[in-house]
C-alpha cells in the first residue's frame, strides 16, 4: 500500500483548496477565536502502528468531510471550491479504505485505538457545537476553516506511522 506519497499529495491539494475557500478577511474575526482542543498531546506522545494511523486519519478526514457536507457549509463557501475540496477528501477516504483492506484484511478491523477515534469525534463535536452557538456566522466558519487547516497539519505524526512497516 503506497499511501504516504499519494496521501501527502491529496492532503496538500485539500489544504490549498481550504486556504482558497476564505470569503471574508480573517482580520475581522479575531474576537471569534475559540479553543477547540485538538488532541495533539495524545497524538504526539504515541507511536502509531500503520493500521492505527490509517484508522485515525480516516476518522479525521471523515469528520471533516461530514462537517463540510452540511447545508450550512454549502451556504458558507463558494460552491465549486467546496465541491473540489469534498472530492479531495472523498478520494483520501477511498485511498485509506483500500489501504485498510490491504493491511489488515477484509475481516479484521483495528480495535486498539478506539480512544484516539473517540478523541477525534469529541473534537469535531466541539467544532459543531461552536458553529451552532455562533449561528454559523461567516466569522465562525473562518475560525473553523483555520482550525481544520491546523489539525490537518498536526496529522503529520500519524503520517509517520504510515511509513513504518509493522
Amino acid at each position: 500500500c503506497d499511501l504516504p506519497q499519494t496521501h501527502s499529495l491529496r492532503n496538500r491539494r485539500a489544504l490549498i483548496l481550504l486556504a482558497q475557500m476564505g470569503r471574508i478577511s480573517p482580520f475581522s474575526c479575531l474576537k471569534d477565536r475559540h479553543e477547540f482542543r485538538f488532541p495533539e498531546e495524545e497524538f504526539d506522545g504515541h507511536q502509531f502502528q500503520k493500521t492505527q494511523a490509517i484508522s485515525v486519519l480516516h476518522e479525521m478526514i471523515q469528520q471533516t468531510f461530514n462537517l463540510f457536507s452540511t447545508e450550512d457549509s454549502s451556504a458558507a463557501w463558494e460552491q465549486s471550491l467546496l465541491e473540489k475540496f469534498s472530492t479531495e477528501l472523498y478520494q483520501q477516504l477511498n485511498d485509506l479504505e483500500a489501504c485498510v483492506i490491504q493491511e489488515v484484511g477484509v475481516e479484521e478491523t483495528p480495535l486498539m485505538n478506539e480512544d484516539f477515534i473517540l478523541a477525534v469525534r469529541k473534537y469535531f463535536q466541539r467544532i459543531t457545537l461552536y458553529l451552532m452557538e455562533k449561528k454559523y456566522s461567516p466569522c465562525a466558519w473562518e475560525v473553523v476553516r483555520a482550525e481544520i487547516m491546523r489539525s490537518f497539519s498536526f496529522s503529520t505524526n500519524l503520517k509517520k506511522g504510515l511509513r513504518r512497516k509493522d
Epitope: 486556504a19 480573517p26 482580520f27 479575531l30 474576537k31 471569534d32 477565536r33 475559540h34 483555520a146 497539519s153
Partner: antibody, heavy 121, light 107 residues
Amino acid sequence: EVQLVQSGAEVKKPGESLKISCKGSGYSFTSYWIGWVRQMPGKGLEWMGIIDPSDSDTAYSPSFQGQVTISADKSISTAYLQWSSLKASDTAMYYCARHPGLNWAPDFDYWGQGTLVTVSS
Amino acid sequence: DIQMTQSPSSLSASVGDRVTITCRASQSIDGSLNWYQQKPGKAPKLLIYFASSLQSGVPSRFSGSGSGTDFTLTISSLQPEDFATYYCQQSYDFPLTFGQGTKVEIK
C-alpha cells in the same frame, strides 16, 4: 527552531524611501501572520499592522494607515515594512513578530531582534 | 480602538517580593490579553497569553488572571532577572493595542 531574522540597522535622510525585512524560518511561514511593532526611543510598544503571508491580506493601525506599507513574499518566507518618504519622527526600533491568526495559540510568541531605523538630516 | 491602561507605570521592589501589575481595557475583551516582558536593548518576550496561560519556557512564578476589562500579572517571588518593563496587550480586536508599560526597578 523558529526564528525571525530582521535586516540590519539603517541610517536615512528625511524624504528617502526604505524597506526593511523579516525572514521566518523553522515553521510554516504561511500558517502564521506577521505583525510589525514600533518602539520609539525610550517609549512603549505600538502595533503598526499585520499581514497574512498566505494571501498578502493586510490590516493596519489607523495611526499608521497610509504611512507605511506591509508586504510579504511567501516564496522566500519574508515580510517587509516600507516607507516611501521617511520623516525624523520615524526614528525608532521596529520589530516583527509571529501571530497565530485565528487559531487558539499564543500571540506574538516569536519576535525578530529588531531593526533600528534612524532618520536624520 | 480599545485603550489599555496599566498601573502602576513604575514600581520599586526587592528580590523575593510579590509583585502585582494591573491592566484595564476600555471595553470588555473577554480573556484576550497577553503579557510581555522587555529588557533594555532586547525584543519583548511573551509571558502569558489568553489572560492566564503560561507561555512555554516561562517560570511558574509568573501568573496571569482576569477577564472582561480587568487583568493582573503576578510575580510570586521577584528574581534578579525579572527587573524589566512589562506590557499588556489586547488581542480581542484590531487595531491591537498595548498598555503603556510598567517598569519594575530594584529598590
